[in-house]
Amino acid sequence: DTHKSEVAHRFKDLGEEHFKGLVLVAFSQYLQQCPFEEHVKLVNEVTEFAKTCVADESAENCDKSLHTLFGDKLCTVATLRETYGEMADCCAKQEPERNECFLQHKDDNPNLPPLVRPEVDVMCTAFHDNEATFLKKYLYEVARRHPYFYAPELLFFAARYKAAFAECCQAADKAACLLPKLDELRDEGKASSAKQRLKCASLQKFGDRAFKAWAVARLSQKFPKAEFAEVSKLVTDLTKVHTECCHGDLLECADDRADLAKYMCENQDSISSKLKECCDKPLLEKSHCLAEVENDEMPADLPSLAADYVESKDVCKNYAEAKDVFLGMFLYEYARRHPDYSVMLLLRLAKAYEATLEKCCAAADPHECYAKVFDEFQPLVEEPQNLVKQNCELFEQLGEYKFQNALLVRYTKKVPQVSTPTLVEVSRNLGKVGAKCCKLPEAKRMPCAEDYLSVVLNRLCVLHEKTPVSEKVTKCCTESLVNRRPCFSALELDEAYVPKAFNAETFTFHADMCTLSEKEKQVKKQTALVELVKHKPKATKEQLKGVMDNFAAFVEKCCKADDKEACFAEEGPKFVAASQAALA
């Protein structure tokens, strides 16, 4: 449905508060280095303009597209060339090329300082002094660091952030109330950002067919009682929402997400029995709740799939008539029966089935050719089952820190060209799969673990794309979305890698080590471990363990010393020499 003024349409649909929040997020995700005040000024100007269009949709410029309006506004920033370099060239382009240009310049790893959390009293004062500015600052700081954060969901995080301060700044012990809430929001926010980044990568690198296949599998697991047509409708709508958000069309995305939530709540009976409690909530909470809703119970009367997909003589006819619909139904039927499978496994199974049909439907006797197709499925199912079992056993044996170290060594040996900070970040996050998934009942382990690993490996792919250094990483990242994790799992020690020359500076530590938090200490030690493996990629587990144990003992000793710096200066070179000897 067309509107005379798109900006007026969205302002009226979303309301002023959400409109302003979303425009701020959009601008902060595009111009990630701009100061807060500059963004607030731009947002206020856009909002005032939108109000004039609401008053009179025929007013000057009100008929322009949102990309034109927002792009024009971004291109008024005076320091664009100095701050962003070649991104300023985007402003010479016309829409839609200009927006595509801005999208291509989004930086997944912006050079921004880590957010430092002020004292609780300082934060509470700032919150009470100017609540609106305080919340805008939150949106701005998160959005610029996470340029693909799911914008309507970020508004939900901001609402929770506001609620935490409103409650805790009144509490007797403000810190005890507030800090756990902020930690939870930070961790959930990072996870939400990474999950959305995979959705955007799926759409942008592999197209909407890949995203739709993912959505069919996931929604069929969630809503196993829903008909295929219902699941298909939800998939189409969800694809539109995420395509818009990933494309920077945040107002349209938020509006369409609200429409989808409304539709789901009006059609609960044909979707899922689990939606009731979500549908009583206010909009932002409702949409979040629907996205996270637990799987409905599987119908008790589902027949074997063999009849329709193997035994039927019409398999090739049905496939040829509408390939994607037939494969979509296969995926739907498989997924609704298997909430115990990861989405990525289900997609591999559908891919294997598709490959078999492509081959067999061109054969002399198609039925004979595909009669045992499901025998090809068993190893695909057992591979992630075994992987989860082995890694959960290792996690239970080692604990999180040492499990992360095992993964650091494993991945550094696979792809030693990757930068040390990236290997540390990715391996630490891969290691978190243990605490997240291994405690779950068996039925939930594989979907938790493999789909989480897909999100973490996407972060590796996104960072590597910015600065490509390894052909192996490029190959695993670009060849097949669903086979990324098996591709990385299959990588062995890189025999072609020339070990990094030893640099004593890398292994020189100072007294500041002693004042670091436990997490920061771990990162320091893990950074050293990666450098060690890059220097000696063929070092054995025992050798590396010995060096790391000596390292821990050396740091502990010097941190207990009266003159810490002198201890580090004296003991450091001894540690380096002993380590070199141990690894010789």
Epitope: H338, P441, A443
Partner: nanobody
Amino acid sequence: EVQLVESGGGLVQEGGSLRLACAASERIWDINLLGWYRQGPGNERELVATITVGDSTSYADSVKGRFTISRDYDKNTLYLQMNSLRPEDTGLYYCKIRRTWHSELWGQGTQVTVSS
């Protein structure tokens, strides 16, 4: 061909407990639902309890709160813990495995007799 073997049946006093087990002779890779059924004297076979691979459980109204269905992945075994048994629980208890790509599998049954 995979076999299902039930065990744990027997004679028990009213109010007593039994634990039935159903073991598969080999690992079954395409299970999607497991269930216990029973056939009382002169009755049709009826559903007692099911558990999906997503760990959702469902029970016949007559056994709710008294029976618990569970499975052990590593041992490839399905269980039915039966407490507060009643004479009307008497019958032949069968386990069933529903598969995604093959015909469903049934065990040969184990007899449960509850005396008053």
